[in-house]
Interface confidence: low
């Protein structure tokens, strides 16, 4: 629909509260270093302007696009050049180039202080003193650290955040009530951010076709009773929503997501039998619930795929008439029959099918040529199955921490040029696949594991893209979205790597390690492990295990000592010397 004033249209659709929240998220995701107060001021100015347009859509500037209005507002920030450097050059451009320029300057790893959680009483006082500011601050802090966070979903997180404080700040034991809820929100938030980052990378780096293929596969698994036409409609709408959010068009995105949830619920009879509970929920919960809904049961007696896609004499004719539609139908039919496959595996199969048809439909005897295409799928299916089996066995044998350590060593040897914090973060997340997926029965392991690994490896890709240091990482990240995981799995030890020089300072520890949480202590130890491998890439598992066991004993001993700092200094020197000897450094 054409509206005289886009800003008035969105304000009316979304309501003031959400309009303000979404504009705050948008601004914080673009200008990640700006103080909270500056953003609130900008948001209030935009909101006041929007109200004038609601009152009179013909008022001055009300006909301007949202990009123009928001971009003009961002470009009024006085310290743009000092704070953001070359990003200030974006302001010299016209739309749509200016918005593209802002998007390119989004920073996946902004130089911001770690969020430290205050005492519960301090948080509750702040919540009660000014609930609105408290919640806005939450939106701001998450949005600036996660510049691709799915904005309508962040509204849902904020609602849960508010609910947690509302309930727990009046509980007898505030901390016991609140802290587990905040931990859960933090962990879910990080996972949600990473999943959305993959969607945006898919759209931005590989294009709409790649995203649509992913969506066809995933929605066909989830809604196997829906017709292909229905799935296609949902894919088109979903692609629009994510294109908007990834492009910074958060008001349009939130509005369209609400419309999509409404459509799904109004048509649930022709989509899925699993949607009833979701559709009884309020909007934000409803949208979240639909996005996470379990797969519907597969229709009984689905015919063999071979009839339409291998045996039919019309395969090449159908393919030639509408290539993407025919491939989409293949993907839909395959995915609805295989909820036990990962989406990326389904996309590999579809790619193999496409490549075969491209070759065979130009051959003298097309049918003879593509008759055995399904045989080519077997090794593609077995590779992730075997990998998951081996790694789940290793996880069950080692437990999460040691499994993470095994992956740390494995990945540091593959790509030792990558920064230590990135290797630690990515390997820890890769290691979480064990506790997340290995508990599942066989039929659910692959979609859980391989699609999760795609999300984690995308984190590596986006962090590496900011400061590229490894051609191998660049190659695996850019050649094929669906083959990223097999590409990384296939990497062997980098024989060209020149070991890092030994620096005793890297292995010097202090008494402050004793007061750290278990998680933070693990990260310290895992950081040391990565550094060890960078110094001695050819160290054996046994050598590294011995050094890490000594290190754990050293930390435990010194944390029990009366004079901890002296213990760390003296015993630390001995440990470094012993480790150097053990590793032949």
């Amino acid at each position: 629909d054409a509206h005289k004033s886009e800003v008035a249209h969105r304000f009316k659709d979304l309501g003031e509260e959400n309009f303000k929240a979404l504009v705050l998220i948008a601004f914080a995701q673009y200008l990640q270093q700006c103080p909270f107060e500056d953003h609130v001021k900008l948001v209030n100015e935009v909101t006041e302007f929007a109200k004038t347009c609601v009152a009179d859509e013909s008022a001055e500037n009300c006909d301007k696009s949202l990009h123009t209005l928001f971009g003009d507002k961002l470009c009024t920030v006085a310290t743009l050049r000092e704070t953001y450097g070359e990003m200030a050059d974006c302001c010299a451009k016209q739309e749509p180039e200016r918005n593209e320029c802002f998007l390119q300057h989004k920073d996946d790893n902004p130089n911001l202080p770690r969020l430290v959680r205050p005492e519960v009483d301090v948080m509750c006082t702040a919540f009660h003193d000014n609930e609105e500011t408290f919640l806005k601050k939450y939106l701001y802090e998450i949005a600036r650290r996660h510049p691709y966070f799915y904005a309508p979903e962040l509204l849902f997180f904020a609602k849960r955040y508010k609910a947690a404080f509302t309930e727990c700040c009046q509980a007898a034991d505030k901390a016991a009530c609140l802290l587990p809820k905040l931990d859960e929100l933090r962990d879910e938030g990080k996972a949600s951010s990473a999943k959305q980052r993959l969607k945006c990378a898919s759209l931005q780096k590989f294009g709409e076709r790649a995203f649509k293929a992913w969506a066809v596969a995933r929605l066909s698994q989830r809604f196997p009773k829906a017709e292909f036409a229905e799935v296609s409609k949902l894919v088109t709408d979903l692609t629009k929503v994510h294109t908007e959010c990834c492009h910074g068009d958060l008001l349009e995105c939130a509005d369209d997501r609400a419309d999509l949830a409404k459509y799904i619920c109004e048509n649930q009879d022709s989509i899925s039998s699993k949607l009833k509970e979701c559709c009884e929920k309020p909007l934000l919960e409803k949208s979240h619930c639909i996005a996470e809904v379990e797969n519907d049961e597969m229709p009984a007696d689905l015919p063999s795929l071979a009839a339409d896609f291998v045996e039919s004499k019309d395969v090449c004719k159908n393919y030639a008439e509408a290539k993407d539609v025919f491939l989409g139908m293949f993907l839909y039919e395959y995915a609805r029959r295989h909820p036990d496959y990962s989406v990326v595996l389904l996309l590999r199969l579809a790619k193999t099918y496409e490549t075969t048809l491209e070759k065979c439909c130009a051959a003298a005897d097309p049918h003879e040529c593509y008759a055995k295409v399904f045989d080519e799928f077997k090794p593609l299916v077995e590779e992730p199955q075997n990998l998951i089996k081996q790694n789940c066995e290793l996880f069950e044998q080692l437990g999460e921490y040691k499994f993470q350590n095994a992956l740390l060593v494995r990945y540091t040897k593959k790509v030792p040029q990558v920064s230590t914090p990135t290797l630690v973060e990515v390997s820890r997340n890769l290691g979480k696949v064990g506790s997340k997926c290995c508990k599942h029965p066989e039929a659910k392991r692959m979609p859980c594991a391989e699609d999760y690994l795609s999300v984690v490896l995308n984190q590596l890709c986006v962090l590496h893209e900011k400061t590229p240091v490894s051609d191998r990482v660049t190659k695996c990240c850019t050649e094929s979205l669906v083959n990223r995981r097999p590409c990384f799995s296939a990497l062997e030890v980098d024989e060209t790597y020149v070991p890092k020089e030994f620096n005793a300072e890297t292995f010097t520890f202090h008494a402050d390690i004793c007061t750290l949480s278990e998680k933070e202590r693990q990260i310290k130890k895992q950081t040391a492990l990565v550094e060890l491998v960078k110094h001695k890439p050819k160290a054996t598992k046994e050598q590294l295990k011995a050094v890490m066991d000594d290190f754990a004993a050293f930390v435990e001993k010194c944390c029990k000592a009366d004079d901890k700092e002296t213990c760390f200094a003296e015993e630390g020197k001995k440990l470094v010397a012993a480790s150097q000897a053990a590793l032949g450094l």
Partner: nanobody, 124 residues
Framework: EVQLVESGGGLVQAGDSLRLSCTAS????????MGWFRRAPGKDREFVGA????????WYSDSVLGRFTISRDNAKNTVYLQMNSLKPEDTAVYYC?????????????????WGQGTQVTVSS
């Protein structure tokens, strides 16, 4: 800011019926549950009932279950409370409210926006 306006209150006899309306000034994007509460003289505000935006789900307090019915007309941004078989103990100021959509619809603290209230008096 969403404004809520209740109407339809008044003085009735025990056993009579009354229909209250509550209209929202705008469609609350994130606030999809609308609830009714009441405050009897000298008592705390208590939950009466609530309805989801879709109208699929409704909740009622035990004291009104079977006598009161909540419905809504989304096109008009309006929610209704149909009260049948009224009793003197139903005398109260009735408030409508909009909840933010995070469960616990029986609790006042879940509701973001409140109307001014409309007086219902049931004489014996």
């Amino acid at each position: 800011e969403v404004q809520l306006v209740e109407s339809g209150g008044g003085l009735v006899q025990a056993g009579d019926s009354l229909r209250l309306s509550c209209t929202a000034s705008e469609r609350p994007f994130m606030s999809y549950v609308m609830g009714w509460f009441r405050r009897a003289p000298g008592k705390d505000r208590e939950f009466v009932g609530a309805i989801t935006w879709s109208g699929i789900n409704t909740w009622y307090s035990d004291s009104v279950l079977g006598r009161f019915t909540i419905s809504r007309d989304n096109a008009k941004n309006t929610v209704y409370l149909q009260m049948n078989s009224l009793k003197p103990e139903d005398t109260a100021v009735y408030y409508c409210a909009v909840a933010d959509g995070v469960g616990l619809y029986r609790y006042e603290r879940q509701y973001d926006y409140w109307g001014q209230g409309t007086q219902v008096t049931v004489s014996s």
